[in-house]
Amino acid sequence: EEELQMIQPEKLLLVTVGKTATLHCTVTSLLPVGPVLWFRGVGPGRELIYNQKEGHFPRVTTVSDLTKRNNMDFSIRISSITPADVGTYYCVKFRKGSPENVEFKSGPGTEMALGAKPS
């Protein structure tokens, strides 16, 4: 069986204040069982950006339909970008646990930076 890979194709994403940014993440396997979450930063202080199961993330939407069967596209869109949104974003696969899920594998990250405003 194929080992799970987390693919974040863009190392750098230049965004414009006020616009919507799309952060891409695809996986190569449905297994192991468990969710994919998005974070900004690494380590214990990282910020949760999106968890489909719980939480309120009004500026985040998923690229793929949440009712899509056997989904392997975990890309997200973040609207109304501000300078506070810059940083490196990681999609992270968790292995289902009881009671706690366990981090299994992280994508390589996509750095979001501000690009020049269009003239």
Partner: antibody, heavy 120, light 108 residues
Framework: EVQLLESGGGVVQPGGSLRLSCAAS????????VTWVRQAPGKGLEWVST??????YYADSVKGRFTISRDNSKNTLYLQMNSLRAEDTAVYYC???????????????WGQGTLVTVSS | EIVLTQSPATLSVSPGERATLSCRAS??????LAWYQQKPGQAPRLLIY???IRETGIPARFSGSGSGTEFTLTISSLQSEDFAVYYC??????????FGGGTKVEIK
């Protein structure tokens, strides 16, 4: 066409052991989690166990007694049942998991089931 | 553990009539709910997932609705082949996956 075929059921005494098998075909077996669900005579459905790749999950009622495993080279799912009790008497179904909502699993294909009777 | 309560336990309906089956969850499961049909001596069959999405090949007379803790399976015009037991299942929080106790739809 997806097919799941259980075997290995039968009559066993309390405290005994049995191994169920489920032969899968018609889908890429190694890419999906698979599950055992049981149904006691005249009763409802009860989840028993699920296996992903190396990850396994059990109902409290069978934890420590049952072991789920899979052989992807044979497209086969197993359930080793030890220390069997009268309350384990049921039809055991294997089912293919399907995921939705980024992390939730339901069961889109089921086998016809194999009957396990635990009786002295 | 999330408990699913189905009501009524038995529903007596005449062919051609509408049947409305209820499934209540003990806590919020968002839309992570499936419905299955089981006929005597047969395995369960998936009807609905994500609370409202009909599985491929399932007739349009079957529809699912609801979210959170209250869900409904509606069979708009019962056919003879629809008399069976129906189960709901949540997959929002597991293990364990949990099923409702079932609703038997019988001929009136």
């Amino acid at each position: 066409e997806v097919q799941l075929l259980e075997s290995g059921g039968g009559v066993v005494q309390p405290g005994g052991s049995l191994r169920l098998s489920c032969a899968a075909s018609g889908f890429s077996f190694s890419n999906f989690a698979v599950t055992w669900v049981r149904q006691a005579p005249g009763k409802g459905l009860e989840w028993v166990s699920t296996i992903g790749s190396g990850d396994t999950y059990y109902a409290d009622s069978v934890k420590g007694r049952f072991t789920i495993s899979r052989d992807n080279s044979k497209n086969t799912l197993y359930l080793q049942m030890n220390s069997l009790r009268a309350e384990d008497t049921a039809v055991y179904y294997c089912a293919k998991d399907s995921t939705v909502s980024w992390s939730g699993d339901f069961f889109d294909y089921w086998g016809q089931g194999t009957l396990v009777t635990v009786s002295s | 553990e999330i408990v699913l309560t189905q009501s009524p336990a038995t529903l007596s309906v005449s062919p051609g009539e509408r049947a409305t089956l209820s499934c209540r969850a003990s806590q919020n499961v968002k839309n992570d709910l499936a419905w299955y049909q089981q006929k005597p001596g047969q395995a369960p069959r998936l009807l609905i997932y994500a609370a409202r999405i009909r599985e491929t090949g399932i007739p349009a007379r079957f529809s699912g609705s609801g979210s959170g803790t209250e869900f409904t399976l509606t069979i708009s015009s019962l056919q003879s082949e629809d008399f069976a037991v129906y189960y709901c299942q949540q997959y929002y929080d597991w293990p364990p996956f949990t099923f409702g106790g079932g609703t038997k739809v019988e001929i009136k």
